[in-house]
Amino acid sequence: MGCTLSAEDKAAVERSKMIDRNLREDGEKAAREVKLLLLGAGESGKSTIVKQMKIIHEAGYSEEECKQYKAVVYSNTIQSIIAIIRAMGRLKIDFGDSARADDARQLFVLAGAAEEGFMTAELAGVIKRLWKDSGVQACFNRSREYQLNDSAAYYLNDLDRIAQPNYIPTQQDVLRTRVKTTGIVETHFTFKDLHFKMFDVGGQRSERKKWIHCFEGVTAIIFCVALSDYDLVLAEDEEMNRMHESMKLFDSICNNKWFTDTSIILFLNKKDLFEEKIKKSPLTICYPEYAGSNTYEEAAAYIQCQFEDLNKRKDTKEIYTHFTCATDTKNVQFVFDAVTDVIIKNNLKDCGLF
C-alpha cells in the first residue's frame, strides 16, 4: 500500500532517468569529440598535415579545387627558380653556360604572367634551360645557405607536365604547394567514430591574438618539427638555428600549464629530406656535442632524445613520437591511425574504462 507511487512521483522518476540518460549521452558525445591543435615552427609541415586529413578523411580535393591551385603551383615554381638565381649572385656562383644570363633576365620579365594561372611555352623553356644549367644545380645543392621551398625540385623536375596548357594539379601537387598560413585554420572530420576538430594555429605573429581561444579543452597537440632544418644557416634576422628555435617552442608547449592534461604527439617530419641531408651535412652543425655516426637511424634518434628530454613531467606525461613525411599520404595515414589509437586509449583512461 505504502509502496505505490503517485503520478507526480512517477513523472519525477521518469524525469530523473531522462536527465541521467542525457548526461550519459552528453558524456559519451564529449568523449567522442577530439580537439587537436597543430603547433610547430614555420614551415614544419603543419598545413600539409591538414591537407592530408582532407585527402584521407574527406575524399580529397575535387578537380575544381585542384584547378584553383594551378596559380599556386606556378607561383611556387617561379619563386623557387628566382630564389636560386638570386642566391647565385650572393654565393658568387657563375652559370655553367654564360647564355643562361639572358634567360635569367628573361625570367624576371616573364614571371608575372604565370602568377595569373597560366605558363607560356616561352617561360617554361626559360625555366627548363636554367634548371638544367650546372651552375644553377651547384647553387641548388647549397640551398641550406639560403631560403628555398622544399618542393622546388619536385616542381622544377616536372616542368614538362606542369607547363602543359591543359594541366590540372594532382593531389600530390596540391600537397606540395606552399602558401603562408594566416590566422587559424579549422578542419573537421570523423574517423574511428571520433569527431575531430583540428586547428592549425601556425599563422603569423600578428594573427596570434586569438590563439588563446584554442587552448582550452585540447585533447592532443601534434607538434611538427622539420628534421631537415638541422643544417640551415642562420638568416640575418634569426637569433638561433631553426632546430633550436623549434626545441625552445616545444619546451614551452610541452611544459605549459594549459596542456597539463593534453597528450603531446611529436611529428619529426621531413624524414625523407633528412635522410638525404644527413649523408652530406653532419649533425654536429646543429648539435656540436653529438658524437654518434651520421646515419639516418642514429642521428634521428638523437634528435628525438633532444626533444623528449625537454619534458619536465616524465613521470606523468608521455610524448608520443612519430617520424613522418607529411607529403606521403600512406605514411600520414599509418601514423594518424596510431595517433587515434592513443587518443582512444587515453579517452578510456580518463573515463576510468582502461
Epitope: 596570434r208 591574438k209 588563446i212 617552442l249 605549459n256 600549464k257
Partner: nanobody, 118 residues
Framework: EVQLVESGGGLVQPGGSLRLSCAAS????????MNWVRQAPGKGLEWVSS????????DYSDSVKGRFTISRDNAKNTVYLEMSDLKVQDTAIYYC???????????WGQGTQVTVSS
C-alpha cells in the same frame, strides 16, 4: 625574475561583485597579451578574458560577457578583472596569465580563489 601576483579574491554572495588585480614584474608588461583564466573544482582550465597589447582590444568568453570587465594599467604593470553579478558557477581559482603571442614566453600567477555562495 618573472612574477605575477593576483589579489582580490574571496567569498561573495550570488549577485555580488569583486575586483581582481594582477601585479606583474620581471618582463616588459606592455608587450604582452594579458589574460584571466579560471579553474573550477575538478575541471580543466577555462579562458575568461584577454586584453591585448598595442590596441588595448578586449575579449570575453560567452559565460562572462556583460558581467566581467578586463582592463590594464601599463604604467603600474597591472591588469584588473572587474566581476559583477557573480554566479555560483563563477566559483574557481582565477589565474593571471601573460602571453607573448608565440607561447615561447608564457607566464602564470599562483591564482586567487573566488567563491560564490549564499
Amino acid at each position: 625574475e618573472v612574477q605575477l601576483v593576483e589579489s582580490g579574491g574571496g567569498l561573495v554572495q550570488p549577485g555580488g561583485s569583486l575586483r581582481l588585480s594582477c601585479a606583474a614584474s620581471g618582463f616588459t608588461f606592455s608587450s604582452y597579451y594579458m589574460n584571466w583564466v579560471r579553474q573550477a573544482p575538478g575541471k580543466g582550465l577555462e579562458w575568461v578574458s584577454s586584453i591585448y597589447n598595442g590596441d588595448g582590444d578586449t575579449d570575453y568568453s560567452d559565460s562572462v560577457k556583460g558581467r566581467f570587465t578586463i582592463s590594464r594599467d601599463n604604467a603600474k604593470n597591472t591588469v584588473y578583472l572587474e566581476m559583477s553579478d557573480l554566479k555560483v558557477q563563477d566559483t574557481a581559482i582565477y589565474y593571471c596569465n601573460a602571453y607573448d603571442g608565440t607561447l615561447l614566453r608564457d607566464y602564470w600567477g599562483q591564482g586567487t580563489q573566488v567563491t560564490v555562495s549564499s
